[in-house]
Amino acid sequence: SAPGEDEECGRVRDFVAKLANNTHQHVFDDLRGSVSLSWVGDSTGVILVLTTFHVPLVIMTFGQSKLYRSEDYGKNFKDITDLINNTFIRTEFGMAIGPENSGKVVLTAEVSGGSRGGRIFRSSDFAKNFVQTDLPFHPLTQMMYSPQNSDYLLALSTENGLWVSKNFGGKWEEIHKAVCLAKWGSDNTIFFTTYANGSCKADLGALELWRTSDLGKSFKTIGVKIYSFGLGGRFLFASVMADKDTTRRIHVSTDQGDTWSMAQLPSVGQEQFYSILAANDDMVFMHVDEPGDTGFGTIFTSDDRGIVYSKSLDRHLYTTTGGETDFTNVTSLRGVYITSVLSEDNSIQTMITFDQGGRWTHLRKPENSECDATAKNKNECSLHIHASYSISQKLNVPMAPLSEPNAVGIVIAHGSVGDAISVMVPDVYISDDGGYSWTKMLEGPHYYTILDSGGIIVAIEHSSRPINVIKFSTDEGQCWQTYTFTRDPIYFTGLASEPGARSMNISIWGFTESFLTSQAVSYTIDFKDILERNCEEKDYTIWLAHSTDPEDYEDGCILGYKEQFLRLRKSSVCQNGRDYVVTKQPSICLCSLEDFLCDFGYYRPENDSKCVEQPELKGHDLEFCLYGREEHLTTNGYRKIPGDKCQGGVNPVREVKDLKKKCTSNFLSPEKQNSKSN
C-alpha cells in the first residue's frame, strides 16, 4: 500500500496551528455560475477572477459577470467590476494576459446586437485600471499578443478579417481579408492563410499561406495549395495538397517560409491528419494518422532540419483531428515523453521514452503495487498512465500527469498496474527520477499540485461529496499529513496555484450550498510557516539523471551528455524559495552509433546500430527522392541526433553517396514564390 500517516513518517510539528494562521477564506457574494481565474505576471501575486452567470430567457439570455482582483496570491479579493463599467465579459474569450511580466490584460465584452463592433477593456498595470475601447469589428478569437512586443495584438473578426493593433488595442487596422488562421511567428512576423473562393472550409487544400514581417505594410505569399500550417520550435510546417490527387504532404521551412523542403513523411488522404506533438529548436515529434478510422497512427521524429524522419512509435493512440492523445512531455527531465498505444487487442498501454523518441518501453511496475485483473501474469506487469484520453472518456481521472521543470525528476499521474489501462478507479503514482521508477503515492483519484519547486506536494481527494481536508507532503509524496481547512465542507471545483510551481500558496475553490443560496468560495493556504527556514547547501544532495547502471562508463548519457543535479533531500523540510534555480552540471559523453540517426535512403536492420543503404527506394521515400531538394539527396548515411552533444568516440564517416542516381525520374524543382506589397 501507499505510504501514509504512520509513526514511520517524519512529521511536521505543530502544522495545524501554522496552517490555520495562514488559511484565508473569501466568499464571493454573487450567484454561482462559472468561475475563471488568471494569474497576471510572474511573482506579482495578482490574480483576476471572473464570475459569470447566465439565465436563458425565452427571447434572450440574461448574463451577469463580476471581476475580482487579488494582489496577495488569493488571500484577499476586491470586487473591481466597476472598473469595467459592470459590463458582461464573454468567457469564451477568457482573459487575455500579456506575455512575461508586461502587466497587460484584455477582456472582451458582450455587446448588444446590431452594434458596429465589439468592445474590449484593456489594462497595462496588472489590472489596477482598465480603459474601454470600442472595436471596429466583432472579434472571432481572443486577442493574440506578439511574443516579442506586448503592444502588438492581432485578432480575427467574424467576417474573417485579420486585424492588427500596434498600440495595445487602442487603434486597430484591418490588414487582410478572407483570413482563415493567423499566428505570430518570431520577430513580430505574422503567418496566415487566406481563401479565394468563398470560405475557409470550401477552400481547404487550396488556401494560400502569407507572411508579413512589418505588421501588414507588405506581404509575401509563401505557399499555395495549403491545407493547414503550424509553427513548432524554429520550424514552420505546411500541409500541402498533391498535384495529382487528394493526398497532402508536409513541407517544412526553417527560414520563415522563404524556402521549403518536402518532409520525408508519408502523405495522408482526406480523412487522415498530421499533428505536431512536440517541437523545440532541435527537432519535432510528428504524428501521422493511419488510413481508416483506426484511432491510431505513427510517431516520427525529425532530424535537425525537420526533413528526414525516423519512425519512433507504431500504433500511437490519437483519436481524430483535434481529438485526444495522451502524448505528454515530462518537463522535469530532459528527453522524457509518455504516451499511449492501442494494442492489437484494442487495449490501451502506456509507453515511455527517455531519449527523445529513440526507444520506447513500458513503465516499470511500482514496487509497492500488485498487478490488477488485466494482468495475465500476476508478477509481471507495468504501470499505465491515465491522461487526456481517459479524461475524455469520463473515467474517474480528475487530472492529467503533472511535471514541472524546476521540480527535477518529479512526475505525478493517475494510473493502474496491469497489462493495460484499467477502467477501475485509479490510484495516484509518483516518480522521483523522471519516470524510471514509480511508487503508489495516494489511494484513489486526487487533484494534485507542486509547490516550492517540489518542496511541497498538495493533494485533494476527488469526491462527489463536499470536502474540507487537504493533504500535503514535504518528502516528494512518501508521507502525507492532512489538514482540515474549514469546519463546513464545500463542493470542490478546483485547485489553483501560480504557474511555475514556485509559489507556497494554494487556493481551493468551490461553492457552498444551502437551502436557498449557492456561493462561490475560495480558501488560500500559505505553506510558508511549514517550511520555516531557507534551504542550505546541506539540504541538497547530488543526483545523476538517467542513471541505470553505474558500472557502465557512460551511465546517465542521454543525447550525448549526462547531467548531475543538486536535489532537495527528502528529509529536509525547508524552503527552496521563489528565486530557486535548478543547479545542474552537464558533462559531455563519448559518441557511439546510438548518437546518430540514419539519413535518407538508409535504415537500421533490427538489433543493429549500423545504418545500411536501402536496396531500393519505395513509397514515400521514392516521392522524397523525386520531389525533395537536391542538396538533401547527398549523404554519408548518418546524421547526428538533434540536440545530441557527444564528442569523440565513434565517428561514422563513410563515403558520401549521391542518392539522385536512385531516383527514377528527373528532379522537379519547387515552384517559385511570389511577393506583393499592400
Partner: antibody, heavy 124, light 106 residues
Framework: QVQLVQSGAEVKKPGSSVKVSCKAS????????ISWVRQAPGQGLEWMGG????????NYAQKFQGRVTITADESTSTAYMELSSLRSEDTAVYYC?????????????????WGQGTTVTVSS | DIQMTQSPSTLSASVGDRVTITCRAS??????LAWYQQKPGKAPKLLIY???SLESGVPSRFSGSGSGTEFTLTISSLQPDDFATYYC????????FGGGTKVEIK
C-alpha cells in the same frame, strides 16, 4: 572486482598538512562517489566528506569544513584527501570508501568497497 | 546534522542467539540507513543498505528493518564469525554514523 588501495602511513607534526591518496582499480571510478571516513584509536567511525569524480563535486562534514580538501583525478582513478592544521586529535586511521549506487543518488546506498586504511599519527 | 543513537553500546551473547541492535535517528531519514560490521584492525564491511536490503555476499541471518527514525539490525542465529562491532549510518543528511555496538562473547 573493484579495489581501493590507499597510500602508506604518515607521521606529521601539529600544524602541518597530510594528503592521503586512494587509487581505484577494476571498476568505473568516475560513476561512484568516494567518501573519506576516519577512526581515532578505540573510537567510532566519523565521516569527513566525499567527492563525485564527474564534475568534481565535493561536500564536507561541518566539523571539517575549511580544513579538509577532497579531490579526484579521473585520468588516474585516484581520490585524495588533504587535512590541514593537524592537531593530535587527528591521529586516526583514515579510510576511503566507495559509495554504492543503485540509482542516480550517489550517497544513499552505503559504502560497499573500502580501502585498507592509512594510519596518520600527529605528534610533536 | 542528523544524530544517530545506537543501543546497546555493548551486547554479550552466545553462539545461536538471536541478536537485535537498534538505531534511532534524530529526524526522519526515510529508509536511507546502512549497517556495517567491523573487526579489529580491519575496514568496515557493508551488511545492509536502504534499511532492509541485504548486500550481496552477506549471509541471510543478517536482516534490517525500520523506516523513518527507528531501525533494527537482527542476527537471527549468532555465529562465531559475527563477534564484532556494528555501526549504523544514515545517508539522507550529511552522512553520520551511530556510536557502535560491540557484540562480545557471553
Amino acid at each position: 572486482q573493484v579495489q581501493l588501495v590507499q597510500s602508506g602511513a604518515e607521521v606529521k607534526k601539529p600544524g602541518s598538512s597530510v594528503k592521503v591518496s586512494c587509487k581505484a582499480s577494476g571498476g568505473t571510478f568516475r560513476n561512484y562517489a568516494i567518501s573519506w571516513v576516519r577512526q581515532a584509536p578505540g573510537q567510532g567511525l566519523e565521516w569527513m566528506g566525499g567527492i563525485i569524480p564527474i564534475g568534481g563535486w565535493a561536500n564536507y562534514a561541518q566539523k571539517f569544513q575549511g580544513r579538509v580538501t577532497i579531490t579526484a583525478d579521473e585520468s588516474t582513478s585516484t581520490a585524495y584527501m588533504e587535512l590541514s592544521s593537524l592537531r593530535s586529535e587527528d591521529t586516526a586511521v583514515y579510510y576511503c570508501a566507495r559509495q554504492g549506487r543503485k540509482t542516480g543518488y550517489y550517497y544513499y546506498y552505503g559504502m560497499d568497497v573500502w580501502g585498507q586504511g592509512t594510519t596518520v599519527t600527529v605528534s610533536s | 546534522d542528523i544524530q544517530m543513537t545506537q543501543s546497546p553500546s555493548t551486547l554479550s551473547a552466545s553462539v545461536g542467539d538471536r541478536v537485535t541492535i537498534t538505531c534511532r535517528a534524530s529526524q526522519s531519514i526515510s529508509s536511507w540507513l546502512a549497517w556495517y560490521q567491523q573487526k579489529p584492525g580491519k575496514a568496515p564491511k557493508l551488511l545492509i543498505y536502504k534499511a532492509s536490503s541485504l548486500e550481496s555476499g552477506v549471509p541471510s541471518r543478517f536482516s534490517g528493518s525500520g523506516s523513518g527514525t527507528e531501525f533494527t539490525l537482527t542476527i537471527s542465529s549468532l555465529q562465531p564469525d559475527d563477534f564484532a562491532t556494528y555501526y549504523c549510518q544514515q545517508a539522507d543528511g550529511h552522512i553520520t554514523f551511530g556510536g557502535g555496538t560491540k557484540v562480545e562473547i557471553k
